[in-house]
């Protein structure tokens, strides 16, 4: 709990806490945190963890708290909670946090990772699926194919992470991706490393040819060596009785 | 610079009414309340009430109430303060001032008020 | 409403002195508490806010304390544009209340 006044949960409720237009924004936007109570309050505070006095505190009469926060910076980026007071309760009490809103104030969203599912190596006629994986929820994943200047597949996803299923003929490839806020206005992430998908192994493939080959000659002497052994054994037994080897 | 012009000093007659304005500059003006302070010759200060220009909500001090009416013009940034039923104990310098989010005031420069027959 | 007793009411001082102003509320206030400078003829001007936050462009020589219901004013050392006027302004409840006010004079 965030003051050690706080009642019970069911006595004082704890308000909601929401951000326009995003809870990730660039430098520079006008962010309004919106902190809405279950019944009229007098006052909203928002709280960043461990504070047991509110950072930015607004007076209303009603059940909602608007913050204006005018061109934020990163710095005023971070963990949130909003509570309440109203003038009938005891000096310093105040509601039940909201649940905690992250605000993330950035440039640019941390690059995110891209592997294949099972594995880079497509096997004839098998599909694969691509995992773009970055660190937020709710964000819109974009997946690109080299050579391709225009986006190969989207996806919004509520995890931090979107799959992008290929069809196995058309999935060798080099393929990058991002992620980027839903909504304006846009953050975007850097582009992941590159991953390259191709057919099993050529190479290997030889390999495998080759081998059978090998092994269908090793076969055939084999044949060729038996059918003589028998062809000899069998004339030794048909020759005159006196003459032996 | 976040600046409060107020309306420049008043003589009004007992009964009459008035109107006192404090145009906001500096900062978005409906991003923040806006407070209304009394100050009677050579005495301390008293709070009358605010208006969040955002939704024209306010709040008054109970000793206030009925006396001073809060209102906002948004396209002008501007509050008004309107006192009715004038009498000598109303005679006093009446202050504007900007609460932020951290617990900053800022002051306008006051407007006086002189209730005279 | 929450009563706001400042003390003193008055006081001289000495260019240079340190010099220490209280206001004790009726109740707590969880340290929303100004302090606040007038002088002759002009409007208040806030130097401290939350107990114990300078105001942008304030002396350093000007300093908050306290919590609860009991806080502090000091100037560590007067000058002569010192002298005016000092409130004390409590904002934890409704209606907000000032405290009678120091008039601090040079000696």
């Known amino acids: 709990d965030i003051t050690p006044s706080v009642p019970p949960a069911s006595y004082h409720p704890k308000p909601w806490l929401g951000a326009q237009p995003a809870t990730v924004v660039t430098p520079g936007v006008n962010v309004t945190l919106r902190c809405r109570a279950p019944q009229p309050a007098w006052r909203f505070g928002l709280f960043k963890p461990g504070e047991i006095a509110p950072l930015l505190f607004r007076d209303v009469s009603s059940e909602l708290a608007e913050f204006f926060l005018e061109e934020v910076t990163p710095a005023q980026g971070g963990s949130y909670r909003c509570c309440y007071r109203r003038p009938d309760w005891g000096p310093g009490v105040w509601s039940q946090p909201s649940d905690v809103l992250e605000l993330l104030v950035t440039e640019e969203l941390p690059r995110p990772s891209l592997v294949a599912l099972p594995g880079p190596v497509v096997g004839p006629g098998a599909n694969v699926s691509l995992r773009c994986a970055g660190r937020l929820r709710n964000m819109s994943f974009v997946l690109y194919r080299e050579g391709v200047a225009a986006p190969l597949q989207y996806r919004h996803s509520a995890q931090p992470w979107a799959d992008f299923t290929l069809l196995g003929a058309r999935a060798p490839g080099t393929y990058s991706c991002y992620y980027h806020t839903p909504s304006a206005p846009y953050v975007l992430s850097q582009r992941s490393e590159v991953l390259v998908i191709s057919w099993e192994d050529s190479g290997s493939s030889d390999y495998t040819r080759g081998n059978l080959v090998r092994l269908g000659l090793a076969g055939l002497v084999l044949i060729s060596l038996g059918a003589l052994v028998t062809f000899d054994w069998r004339s030794q037994n048909r020759a005159p009785a006196g003459i032996r080897p | 610079e976040i600046q409060l012009q107020q309306s420049g000093p008043e003589l009004v007659k007992p009964g009459a009414s008035v109107k006192v304005s404090c145009k906001a500059s500096?900062?978005?003006?409906?991003?923040?309340?806006m407070y209304w302070v009394k100050q009677s010759h050579g005495k301390s200060l008293e709070w009358i009430g605010y208006?969040?220009?955002?939704?024209?909500?306010?709040r008054y001090n109970q000793k206030f109430k009925g006396k001073a009416t809060l209102t906002v013009d948004k396209s002008s940034s501007t509050a008004y303060m309107h006192l009715n039923s004038l009498t000598s104990e109303d005679s006093a310098v009446y202050y504007c001032?900007?609460?932020?989010?951290?617990?900053?005031?800022?002051w306008g420069q006051g407007t006086t008020l002189t209730v005279s027959s | 409403d929450i009563k706001m007793t400042q003390s003193p009411s008055s006081m001289y001082a000495s260019l240079g002195e340190r010099v220490t102003i209280t206001c004790k509320a009726s109740?707590?206030?969880?340290?929303?508490l100004s302090w606040l400078q007038q002088k002759p003829g002009k409007s208040p001007k806030t130097l401290i806010y939350?107990?114990?936050r300078l105001v942008d462009g304030v002396p350093s020589r000007f300093s908050g304390s306290g919590s609860g219901q009991d806080y502090s004013l000091t100037i560590s050392s007067l000058e002569y544009e010192d002298m005016g006027i000092y409130y004390c302004?409590?904002?934890?409840?409704?209606?907000?209340?000032f405290g009678g006010g120091t008039k601090l004079e040079i000696k």
């Open positions: 001032a900007r609460l932020d989010y951290y617990g900053n005031f800022y």
């Open positions: 500096g900062y978005v003006f409906t991003s923040y309340n």
């Open positions: 208006i969040d220009p955002y939704n024209g909500g306010t």
């Open positions: 109740q707590d206030i969880n340290s929303f």
């Open positions: 939350r107990a114990n």
């Open positions: 302004l409590q904002y934890d409840d409704f209606p907000y209340t």
